[in-house]
């Protein structure tokens, strides 16, 4: 039979290559079948018999057509600061991503190595750039005429209300207090909240759990108002 319609195993033509979903077995010197995702090579091919494939065992996987003798182990369970966005199956590894209110501070090939809590801007500061799944919030001081009186990872600086008669002038951390009954805003306040990072999960209120730490991960409780709370997954 011509090579293009040959059944595995077969010897490739000189200088030729094996077809899609086949590999060249050095020992048998034949083109042999690869195993499909979710399976691995239980018995390698010979000159007269093709590859024998078998299903991956629990907690192991192969994602590609392959001829590996053993399936790959799925990653460890997701840590408490993460959610499982892709379960471990015979065809795919587990993927852990940071939960709402957290971001990935250090990524790995699939998923996240280190999650950290999104920065909360203190009063007088507003969100200049919202957090994403892979970047922290950036805060900025509220410019004259604007304020933020919250500690939040979503609140922006809002304009002071305009008073007919000012009782107490506003500043960066406090709105103006009016003596009249119908204050107006200096401009349309816009959305006070910036969206939480895009996620496939439903959003909840910002969690403030005690961060978890995997063995071997440095976890420093900093002075004072604790800058980044962080957690990690074991590799």
């Amino acid at each position: 039979l011509p090579a293009q319609v040959a059944f595995t195993p077969y010897a490739p033509e000189p200088g030729g290559t094996c077809r899609l979903r086949e590999y060249y077995d050095q020992t048998a010197q034949m083109c042999c079948s690869k195993c499909p995702p979710g399976q691995h090579a239980k018995v390698f091919c010979t000159k007269t018999s093709d590859t024998v494939c078998d299903s991956c065992e629990d907690s192991t996987y192969t994602q590609l057509w392959n001829w590996v003798p053993e399936c790959l182990s799925c990653g460890s369970r997701c840590s408490s600061d993460q959610v499982e966005t892709q379960a471990c199956t015979r065809e795919q590894n587990r993927i852990c991503t940071c939960r709402p209110g957290w971001y990935c501070a250090l990524s790995k090939q699939e998923g996240c190595r280190l999650c950290a809590q999104l920065r909360k801007c203190r009063p007088g500061f507003g969100v200049a750039r919202p957090g994403t799944e892979t970047s922290d919030v950036v805060c900025k001081p509220c410019a004259p005429g604007t304020f933020s009186n919250t500690t939040s990872s979503t609140d922006i600086c809002r304009p002071h209300q305009i008073c007919h008669v000012v009782a107490i002038p506003g500043n960066a951390s406090m709105d103006a207090v009016c003596t009249s009954t119908s204050p107006t805003r200096s401009m349309a306040p816009g959305a006070v909240h910036l969206p939480q990072p895009v996620s496939t999960r439903s959003q909840h209120t910002q969690p403030t759990p005690a961060p978890s730490t995997a063995p071997g991960t440095s976890f420093l409780l900093p002075v004072g108002p604790s800058p980044p709370a962080e957690g990690s997954t074991g590799d």
């Epitope: 501070a105 250090l106 002075v223 800058p227 980044p228």
Partner: antibody, heavy 121, light 107 residues
Framework: EVQLQESGGGLVQPGGSLNLSCAAS????????LSWVRQTPGKRLEWVAY????????YYSDTVKGRFTITRDNAKNTLYLQMSSLKSEDTAMYYC??????????????WGQGTTVTVSS | DILMTQSPASLSLFVGETVTITCRAS??????LAWYQQKQGKSPQLLVY???KLAEGVPSRFSGSESGTQYSLKINSLQSEDFGTYYC?????????FGGGTKLEIK
Amino acid sequence: EVQLQESGGGLVQPGGSLNLSCAASGFAFSTYDLSWVRQTPGKRLEWVAYINNGGISTYYSDTVKGRFTITRDNAKNTLYLQMSSLKSEDTAMYYCVRGPFYGSANYFDYWGQGTTVTVSS
Amino acid sequence: DILMTQSPASLSLFVGETVTITCRASENIYSNLAWYQQKQGKSPQLLVYDATKLAEGVPSRFSGSESGTQYSLKINSLQSEDFGTYYCQHFWVTPWTFGGGTKLEIK
């Protein structure tokens, strides 16, 4: 234990360049904002540059803007300061510092031992 | 730029005395102020942040206070290890400027 170790200082002629590095250990580097602060021979402290944890946001003092560049490599736990068009007034001890966690925790909580930069002909 | 005017520039005191160092900001810095101590040949160390909060491990004889744009660092019953140079620094808008320093010497 948090450690910040600067290197790369030395003697350079006016108009020359120098690259400072800061190797960090003992904390989750990629979650912290970092800065460079210098101390002049007259003992005045001057904040030089800042970079946020993800390297997205950088700020500079007016005295170095356009001449110095702050960068970081979170995979290597290292902070950098590229200095060009150096002037005699850049002569100082340069400290790598952790912080501020700007807008949230505004302070420098750890300082390195410093590296000396001398700009002179 | 926000100017931080620190006073006095230097002073000489006995162990056991009380001292107050002040820093005046040229505009409102909303309590975004830190105090550092630096000893000869060493790097500065954080003492106080947010104007009034003591950093971890700092003795309670140190205290920070504020009144408008004036910020103060008070050291009760000076100990020999308290002598050195003290700096204030604001963290409002950039540049984050330092005060000129107060050199505290032992008498």
